[in-house]
């Protein structure tokens, strides 16, 4: 199911009508930080460093864009999803 | 799969509060909305308000609000809708619903909790 | 907030026959940044909670018959079931997405004639 979320959440950000998803316009690529300790498991971006980008919507990373996505709530748009609905 | 199971049927007096709970499973509670919707006997369905447990924003609806709170508990993927100051108008069958995703936006319900009956009465 | 209207409030098909619900809402639908109504119908059967049937106005979610369709744009949407059977019989509500507060219609109820 999770899978089909990414999937779905990957096409849009692809599409050619990416309003309503959105990356931030100053992509912060930088150098890549080292795996931690462990399994090596990478933490979502969008839990601290991207945590309050999207406004009325929620924050999504494509790893493949290596940016944040916002899916907005009802009535909302944009970049960050700050714009309502008129 | 996904499911959403809710708390039993409560009976309440009036000027008291009801809390019903929604626990989710099947799917990663945080990606999607949890929305609650009502149905009074023989009526139809009326939007309550919802939360979005990844970023925590709530949204109401006005005709709720003073009277409707509704949580979620990211460590064991439940959600709570708690209506206080019952009147006998609040009697209905309460669902919680997951609010899913598709082109960008949220906003249609696709699975949903068997209800729970709260009755109101003196 | 968006009133959504659906008519007939009562509808009687026989078996094997199109059965075609409408809902019309207060103001548009149509988000300007995908082109695609934010509209969604529901089916409801007695004893049990809402199904999701189409979301946009037209997309059918998984595993729904494809007897059911939905079109329309704008303000005027449509429900149609290309052939009724006898496990269609239930009430059917639309449901905006488009702003807060999110709205329903009040529903239609289909009989078998």
């Known amino acids: 199911d999770l899978q089909e979320a990414d999937l779905d959440l990957l096409r849009v950000t692809l599409s050619s009508k990416p309003q309503a998803l959105a990356t931030p316009n100053k992509e912060e690529h930088g150098k890549r930080k080292k795996k931690g300790k462990g399994l090596g498991k990478k933490r979502d971006p969008c839990l601290r460093k991207y945590k309050d980008f999207c406004i009325h919507g929620e924050c999504k990373y494509v790893k493949e864009l290596r940016a944040p996505s916002c899916i907005c709530h009802p009535g909302y748009h944009g970049e960050r999803c700050h714009g309502l609905s008129l | 799969q996904v499911q959403l199971v809710q708390s039993g049927a409560e009976v309440k007096k009036p000027g008291a509060s009801v809390k019903v709970s929604c626990k989710a499973s099947?799917?990663?509670?945080?990606?999607?909305?949890i929305t609650w919707v009502r149905q009074a006997p023989g009526q139809g369905l009326e939007w309550m308000g919802e939360?979005?447990?990844?970023?925590?924003?709530?949204y109401y609806n006005e005709k709720f609000k003073g009277r409707v709170t509704i949580t979620a508990d990211k460590s064991t993927s439940t959600a709570y809708m708690e209506l206080s100051s019952l009147r006998s108008e609040d009697t209905a069958v309460y669902y919680c619903?997951?609010?899913?995703?598709?082109?960008?936006?949220?906003?249609?319900?696709?699975?949903w909790g068997q209800g729970t009956l709260v009755t109101v009465s003196s | 907030d968006i009133v959504m209207t659906q008519s007939p409030d009562s509808l009687a098909v026989s078996l094997g026959e199109r059965a075609t619900i409408n809902c019309k809402s207060s103001q548009s639908l149509l988000y300007s940044t995908n082109q695609k109504n934010s509209l969604a119908w529901y089916q409801q059967k007695p004893g049990q909670p809402p199904k999701l049937l189409i979301y946009?106005?037209?997309t059918r979610e998984s595993g729904v018959p494809d007897r059911f369709s939905g079109s329309g744009s704008g303000t005027d949407f449509t429900l149609t079931i290309s052939s009724l059977q006898a496990e269609d019989v239930a009430v059917y509500y639309c449901?905006?997405?488009?702003?807060?507060?999110?709205?329903f219609g009040q529903g239609t109820k289909l009989e078998i004639k």
């Open positions: 449901q905006q997405y488009y702003r807060y507060p999110l709205t």
């Open positions: 099947g799917y990663t509670f945080t990606t999607y909305g």
């Open positions: 939360i979005f447990p990844g970023s925590g924003n709530t």
């Open positions: 946009w106005a037209s």
């Open positions: 619903a997951r609010e899913s995703f598709s082109d960008g936006y949220y906003g249609y319900f696709d699975y």
